[in-house]
């Protein structure tokens, strides 16, 4: 386990002609924040693929207002590092995406609007525990300067954070095959990935998944003493063959700690030491919060800022899963009517309509309006011998006879009213709430409780539901 750390040094216009316009103005002050997404390996992955190594979001930077006539300077940055905890081994080679987001602070009714200013990506080799690596990346006319490093979280050590440092079991030496753990000379290195439940006191491993026993101990998890002279921790019934007390199953046998937690025995039971991001008696509860940027692919994170508060990812169209990590085959929903061909372009769906049909979903039959009625308050619109029904809200289809109700999924939070249309749905927020899905409370002073992850859409924009 360990942490990838990213330090942004500057974000501003790059060298050369064509300096970008300032993203903020006197009319629309704004502030920046950054999102980093990490993936293992050097593969050229799509921007939407899951951030398998993790993701993080920075704090908001200071509010910036452009000075008219002045050249765009380096923009004020958020304080602090972006930290991406990783639970398993550091892969050594990784891909990164760093996004620069702008938060407009104008007087729009739906609250602040977010837009992506720049996205840089790269593939690097990096050993954990090494010094800071410096980098410069350009995105269009913008330039981003940053440093990064990977460091192991104690007790893990090594270039991949795969070895543990543990207190010595004997005062003068480390166990067989174990080296002193520099710089903690009073501790010993041991591989992190021994067989689950391998006794931390009496077992060790040199290969992942194995459990080799110290002298005097045996059994698959090194929990059984070899002879009477090794009856060190009696807790079971007497054994007639050895004349000593053979241990019964210990509370840590089989390692009850989930998600990489380490087990230690207590007088009455056991205790799990959980890795970062997990908590609970058996480390079974994820302590990830919105501050950790858990929502991928532009998912909007809603939830508390403290580890006891769960989070929910509101996924943008085309993605699903608890962290918006899965791409939806949206064409499998057969959104194109009247035999239209569905094309999933990633950012949107397109329907290629058969002759005689038109509309975003090929729902309009291009016949003459004569003698033709559109149901449910729809109106027939003619044009060059063609017709279509323009349907009232909540209805669709060639004759407006079908109820189109994406609102049944209850997408609007806090009592917001959902309105549907062929172009998408919107939420009209109840008093005291704001945001595209009414997820943010408006505080009495007019400020809003902002999300900890950037949504892919500005509040108030129609959100496509196919």
């Amino acid at each position: 386990a360990g942490v990838f750390e990213l330090q942004i040094h500057s974000f501003g216009p790059g060298p050369g002609p064509g300096a970008p316009r300032s993203p903020c103005s006197a009319r629309l002050p704004c502030r920046l924040f950054f999102r980093v997404c990490l993936k293992p390996g050097l593969s050229e992955e799509a921007a939407e693929s899951p951030c398998a190594l993790g993701a993080a979001l920075s704090a908001r930077g200071p509010v910036y207002t452009e000075q008219p006539g002045a050249p765009a300077p380096d923009l004020p940055l958020p304080d602090g590092l972006l930290q991406v905890p990783f639970r398993d081994a550091w892969p050594g080679t990784f891909s990164f995406i760093i996004e620069t987001w702008r938060e407009e602070l104008g007087d729009q009714i739906g609250g602040p609007a977010w837009s992506l200013l720049a996205r840089v990506a790269g593939r690097r080799r990096l050993a954990a525990g090494g010094p800071w690596a410096r980098d410069i990346q350009r995105a269009g006319a913008w330039e981003l300067r940053f440093s990064y490093r990977a460091r192991c979280e104690p007790p893990a050590v090594g270039t991949a954070c795969t070895r543990l440092c543990r207190p010595r079991s004997a005062p003068s030496r480390c166990g067989p095959g174990l080296r002193p753990c520099a710089p903690l000379e009073d501790e010993c290195e041991a591989p992190l990935v021994c067989r689950a439940g391998c006794s931390p006191e009496h077992g060790f491993c040199e290969q992942p998944g194995e459990c080799r026993c110290l002298e005097g101990w045996t059994g698959p998890l090194c929990t059984v003493p070899v002879s009477t002279s090794s009856c060190l921790s009696p807790r079971g019934p007497s054994s007639a063959t050895t004349g000593c007390l053979v241990p019964g199953p210990g509370p840590c046998d089989g390692n009850p700690c989930a998600n990489g937690g380490s087990c230690s025995e207590t007088p009455r039971s056991f205790e799990c030491t959980c890795p970062r991001g997990f908590y609970g008696l058996r480390c079974e509860v994820s302590g990830v919060t919105c501050a950790d940027g858990p929502c991928f692919n532009g998912g909007l994170c809603v939830g508390g800022a403290d580890p006891d508060s769960a989070y929910i990812c509101h996924c943008p169209p085309g993605f699903q899963g608890s962290n918006c990590e899965k791409r939806v085959d949206r064409c499998s929903l057969q959104p194109c009517r009247n035999g239209g061909l569905c094309l999933d372009l990633g950012h949107a769906l397109r329907c290629r309509c058969r002759a005689g049909f038109a509309g975003p979903r090929c729902e309009h039959d291009l016949d003459d309006c004569a003698g033709r009625a559109c149901a449910n308050g729809g109106t027939c619109v003619e044009g060059g011998g063609a017709h279509r029904c323009s349907c009232a809200l909540g209805f669709g289809g060639r004759d407006c006879r079908e109820r189109a109700d994406p609102c049944a999924a209850r997408p609007c939070a806090h009592g917001g009213r959902c309105y549907a249309h062929f172009s998408g749905l919107v939420c009209a927020c109840a008093p005291g709430y704001m945001g595209a899905r009414c997820e943010f409370p408006v505080h009495p002073d007019g400020a809003s409780a902002l999300p900890a992850a950037p949504p892919g859409l500005r509040p108030g924009d129609p959100q496509r539901y196919l």
Partner: antibody
Framework: QVQLVQSGAEVKKPGSSVKVSCKAS????????ISWVRQAPGQGLEWMGG????????NYAQKFQDRVTITADKSTNTAYMELTSLTSEDTAVYYC????????WGRGTMVTVSS | DIVMTQSPLSSPVTLGQPASISCRSS???????????LNWLQQRPGQPPRLLIY???NPFSGVPDRFSGSGAGTDFTLKISRVEAEDVGVYYC?????????FGPGTKVEIK
Amino acid sequence: QVQLVQSGAEVKKPGSSVKVSCKASGGTLSSYVISWVRQAPGQGLEWMGGIIPIFGTANYAQKFQDRVTITADKSTNTAYMELTSLTSEDTAVYYCARDPFSDLWGRGTMVTVSS
Amino acid sequence: DIVMTQSPLSSPVTLGQPASISCRSSQSLVHSDGNTYLNWLQQRPGQPPRLLIYQISNPFSGVPDRFSGSGAGTDFTLKISRVEAEDVGVYYCMQATQFPHTFGPGTKVEIK
């Protein structure tokens, strides 16, 4: 603080049309329904129709379906209600309101139809 | 269209006494998104309407806590726990669950 600001009072001849405006100052009309409600002297409130500016789709009460047109201009944050073929029975105060919660109302526009 | 009815249509009350207004809809006001868009409005003489309660029972900001709403489905009630002089006016229930939105005929609250 968002406010709905309506255009001024109108005096119209029977058979003519009137177009009343409703501007959101300090915010956008956005994803709410902007409804038009009228109140004849001494009478109750009557919903004429509404529009969601972001969709541009209007919905009308049956009674007004043939005479009213509701539009919105997103660039100016303004909604409009045009009522045609006016008669003396259309003399009323015309309000715009932000629905579905009716939490914002304009001050009203008095339309008098008189020959 | 959903028809809204109110009773009583007129309610003379004594200052400091409670008042109750009933509102009934011709069909359920529960929207497919699970919410019920039933609002209560107050209109004082010579003024535009003003929101008191939204979604059956949620008081709008700045509304005195003597006003409360309750109900479900098709039957709804507005209560004033102790009527004050400034409460004189007409009270309307209104549904925004379904287009066209519709108002009740109004209940006139006056002081005895």
